[in-house]
Interface confidence: low
């Protein structure tokens, strides 16, 4: 899997999970989240050569097409596969609210 | 939806469905498929600005991060959302076989 266990331990130009820490105030301008201050969101990036962690049959077709027609603009892209939620604390007035924001943390990637 | 009904009728730089016809022999080097000779595979391409058809909360976070930090390499990507199968005819020896190849045709796109 193109997850932290693999990607953070290998230098990989192809599609892989990349570390990204996001500070809610500094990076997003969000002041409404009280906790946490930020989190390890991660992101996916890298090339998608033929058969590299292809998501669907179409991805395989597109990457093969791109191999044979390298000048073409049609090529697969490295995107998130498994995501996890993040528990946040925010306020409505003086009332603290705990909520899970779904799909906030990328755990693994794929070519799609 | 970023499908043919919208994307093929509008000039759109942002993430959208793009037409792509693939000839099995010419574009993929596949000689084993007897029918069809090719098909409208389509593909997804275009920019993913903040809130443009975002797939997940992480995509929204990433596109907003990218807006505030335009020099960052972390940005969402335009990829396939809905896919459809393609029915093909091929031969094993002299015996014709009909099969459905799943996820061969892109019908709509999303930012992920």
């Amino acid at each position: 899997a193109l997850d932290a266990a693999y990607c953070f331990r290998n230098v990989q130009d192809n599609c892989c999970l990349r570390p990204l820490y996001i500070d809610f105030k500094r990076d997003l301008g969000w002041k409404w989240i009280h906790e946490p201050k930020g989190y390890n969101a991660n992101f996916c990036a890298g090339a998608c050569p033929y058969l590299w962690s292809s998501d669907t049959q179409h991805t395989k077709v597109l990457s093969l097409y791109n191999t044979i027609n390298p000048e073409a603009s049609a090529s697969p892209c490295c995107v998130s596969q498994d995501l996890e939620p993040l528990t946040i604390l925010y306020y409505i007035g003086n009332t603290p609210k705990i909520e899970q924001l779904s799909n906030m943390i990328v755990k693994s990637c794929k070519c799609s | 939806a970023l499908d043919a009904a919208y994307c093929f009728r509008n000039v759109q730089d942002n993430c959208c469905l793009r037409p792509l016809y693939i000839d099995f022999k010419r574009d993929l080097g596949w000689k084993w498929i007897h029918e069809p000779k090719g098909y409208n595979a389509n593909f997804c391409a275009g920019a993913c600005p903040y809130l443009w058809s975002s797939d997940t909360q992480h995509t929204k976070v990433l596109s907003l991060y990218n807006t505030i930090n335009p020099e960052a390499s972390a940005s969402p990507c335009c990829v396939s959302q809905d896919l459809e199968p393609l029915t093909i005819l091929y031969y094993i020896g002299n015996t014709p076989k009909i099969e459905q190849l799943s996820n061969m045709i892109v019908k709509s796109c999303k930012c992920s």
Epitope: Y21, H34, E35, P36, K37, G38, Y39, N40, L86, T87, I88, L89, Y91, N94, T95, P96, I98 | -
Partner: antibody, heavy 118, light 108 residues
């Protein structure tokens, strides 16, 4: 001034029930959460859980979930910590504390020493 | 379960600077709070939200956070600063967690 006054020390036998109290004064009781913290003899602080006295919403540490019950009576500005069946390992000092905003405790009670021994 | 790690004890000479650390996997993303507890007394909040000081707490007390380590700094240490110090923060489910505590000894 803000004060949290806790009930007095208790000596109990294993299997007995107990309810200790924490009375808040000098502030709007329903606008702040009340947390309970355990300190076993010679040991560190352990967060047990908290209550929103305004709406009686509670949140427990996984270590204490099902072991204790936190409640409150907003009409008398008092929070409670109770056990239905005490164990010797419940012997500890128990503090209540006011939770300001979210995660920090700005005022503490003086503590209630609970001793469970046969 | 999530843990915050503190040194068991820290010694500082009278008038010098003491630094007490608190480390945990989530600490880079969450606020840390610090409490002082003297023998036989209830804890007292000395730093909240990593670096903010409640009114009544001397300026000698300051807090910072770098990476996954929060630090409580006590400058110009006095005999009255001798106490146990606890950090507190959260796990990923926003359950509060205390560090194990650090006994500060002021020498001289």
């Amino acid at each position: 001034q803000v004060q949290l006054v806790q009930s007095g020390a208790e000596v109990k036998k294993p299997g007995e029930s107990l309810k200790i109290s924490c009375k808040g004064s000098g502030y709007s009781f329903t606008r702040y959460y009340v947390a309970w913290v355990r300190q076993m003899p010679g040991k560190g602080l352990e967060w047990m859980g908290w209550i929103d006295p305004g709406q009686s919403n509670t949140r427990y540490s996984p270590s204490f979930q099902g072991q204790v019950t936190i409640s409150a009576d907003k009409s008398i500005s008092t929070a409670y910590l109770q056990w239905s069946s005490l164990k010797a390992s419940d012997t500890a000092m128990y503090y209540c504390a006011r939770m300001l905003a979210w995660g920090w405790f700005d005022y503490w009670g003086q503590g209630t020493l609970v001793t469970v021994s046969s | 379960s999530y843990e915050l790690t503190q040194p068991l004890s820290v010694s500082v000479a009278l008038g010098q600077t003491a630094r007490i650390t608190c480390s945990g996997d989530n600490l880079g993303g969450y606020y840390a709070h610090w409490y002082q507890q003297k023998p036989g007394q209830a804890p007292v909040l000395v730093i909240y939200d990593t670096s903010d000081r409640p009114s009544g707490i001397p300026e000698r007390f300051s807090g910072s956070n770098s990476g996954n380590t929060a630090t409580l700094t006590i400058s110009r240490a006095q005999a009255g600063d001798e106490a146990d110090y606890y950090c507190a923060s959260y796990d990923s489910s926003l359950m509060m967690v205390f560090g194990g505590g650090t006994k500060l000894t002021v020498l001289g």
